[in-house]
């Protein structure tokens, strides 16, 4: 089939990085500057994407592949091929389908990326909560309740009943 096709259509012999030039008896011509063809047999080359403004060049355009963009610091890509840039979330938030959402009670995120994770359950290790958790920080576990001086008490919050990374929409 390939051989038959190439007999019928000389353009099928043109490799990636070239185009089949109708103005020159269907000779395979190299893609002009700032253009590319990622597959063989193309009759035109595509214009290279330019990464401008909030978009930065991650990979330069070549004769066989388009440029790839990412986002300037403080932003991250959305969409196929980084078509949009979205502001990074704050600490204490996670990125959901609807954008940045505060961590639910009992979870935290100490970074500007990623998901909210449940606070450590100190009681699982036989310890007590020394410092309470926040949206931005995990709890700090201290000595086990038995190790505490008489009269001292500590409250260990129940482990949150949610899967890590799940956030109500």
């Amino acid at each position: 089939f390939e051989r038959t096709r190439s007999l019928q259509d000389p353009c099928s012999n043109c490799p990636a990085g070239t185009f089949c030039d109708n103005n020159r008896n269907q000779i395979c011509s190299p893609c002009p500057p700032n253009s590319f063809s990622s597959a063989g047999g193309q009759r035109t080359c595509d214009i290279c994407r330019q990464c401008k403004g909030v978009f930065r060049t991650r990979k330069e355009c070549s004769s066989t592949s388009n440029a790839e963009c990412d986002c300037t610091p403080g932003f991250h890509c959305l969409g196929a091929g980084c078509s949009m840039c979205e502001q990074d979330c704050k600490q204490g938030q996670e990125l959901t389908k609807k954008g940045c959402k505060d961590c639910c009670f009992g979870t935290f995120n100490d970074q500007k990326r990623g998901i909210c994770r449940p606070w450590t359950n100190c009681s699982l290790d036989g310890k007590s909560v020394l410092v309470n958790g926040t949206k931005e920080r995990d709890v700090v576990c201290g000595p086990s309740p038995a190790d505490l001086s008489p009269g001292a008490s500590s409250v260990t919050p129940p482990a949150p009943a949610r899967e890590p990374g799940h956030s109500p929409q």
Epitope: Q50, K52, G53, V54, T72, F75, L78, G79, A80, S83, M84, C85, E86, K97, K98
Partner: antibody, heavy 116, light 107 residues
Framework: QVQLVQSGAEVVKPGASVKVSCKAS????????MHWVRQAPGQGLGWMGA????????DYNQKFKDRVTMTADTSISTAYMELSRLRSDDTAVYYC?????????WGQGTLVTVSS | DIQMTQSPSSLSASVGDRVTITCRAS??????LNWYQQKPGGAVKLLIY???RLHSGVPSRFSGSGSGTDYTLTISSLQPEDFATYFC?????????FGGGTKVEIR
């Protein structure tokens, strides 16, 4: 906070030019493309073009290509849109807007009235 | 150019109503669809970007959905401040193009 403040309303004669300014504050002006959108009375929104303040590179809507010039002065965080050979159907509100692949912040708009 | 067809062009609704506005693109825009609100004074505000992501400060009664060529903006319970004109806009290709707008009026 991020803000775009545009120049005031203009009344200009047919055949003349108008230059609208858009001053940005609250972010790094050079780091984001600025787009211009217009809206004729009672009509929808129409994209005119964009400028990358860092390089001065522009993309214009073919409809305005021969009449519009977009420039930017990074030293004063201001973008400009100049439209020449004005006609009565260029009467519209002109908006500047910051681009992230979506227009997250808009200027308040500048009404340009073309009238003899 | 990618054509954006918005419907309806206007609608009348009451406070508390659920309102749905649709936007159809002339070709696949791969979820690169944004929604804006324009109040009578002229101010334009971003509501939703990338089909379904709520812009900061926008109430959760606004939501977006869709894929390919068909997209929807929904207001789950219309509030007095929501009476305005809504525009969709594609960011898939230059030139950026907008729908014709939907004016939401008080019934």
């Amino acid at each position: 906070q991020v803000q775009l403040v545009q120049s005031g309303a203009e009344v200009v004669k047919p055949g003349a030019s108008v230059k609208v300014s858009c001053k940005a504050s609250g972010y790094t002006f050079a780091g984001f493309e600025m787009h211009w959108v217009r809206q004729a009375p009672g009509q929808g929104l129409g994209w005119m073009g964009a400028i990358d303040p860092k390089t001065g590179g522009t993309d214009y809507n073919q409809k305005f290509k021969d009449r519009v010039t977009m420039t930017a002065d990074t030293s004063i965080s201001t973008a400009y849109m100049e439209l020449s050979r004005l006609r009565s159907d260029d009467t519209a509100v002109y908006y500047c807007t910051r681009d992230l692949g979506y227009f997250d912040v808009w200027g308040q708009g500048t009404l340009v009235t073309v009238s003899s | 150019d990618i054509q954006m067809t918005q419907s309806p062009s206007s609608l009348s609704a009451s406070v508390g109503d659920r309102v749905t506005i649709t936007c159809r693109a002339s070709q696949d825009i791969r979820s690169n669809l944004n929604w804006y609100q324009q109040k009578p004074g002229g101010a334009v505000k971003l509501l939703i970007y990338y089909t379904s992501r709520l812009h900061s400060g926008v109430p959760s009664r606004f939501s977006g959905s869709g894929s390919g060529t068909d997209y929807t903006l929904t207001i789950s319970s219309l509030q007095p401040e929501d009476f305005a004109t809504y525009f969709c806009q594609q960011s898939e290709k230059l030139p950026r193009t907008f729908g014709g707008g939907t004016k939401v009026e008080i019934r």
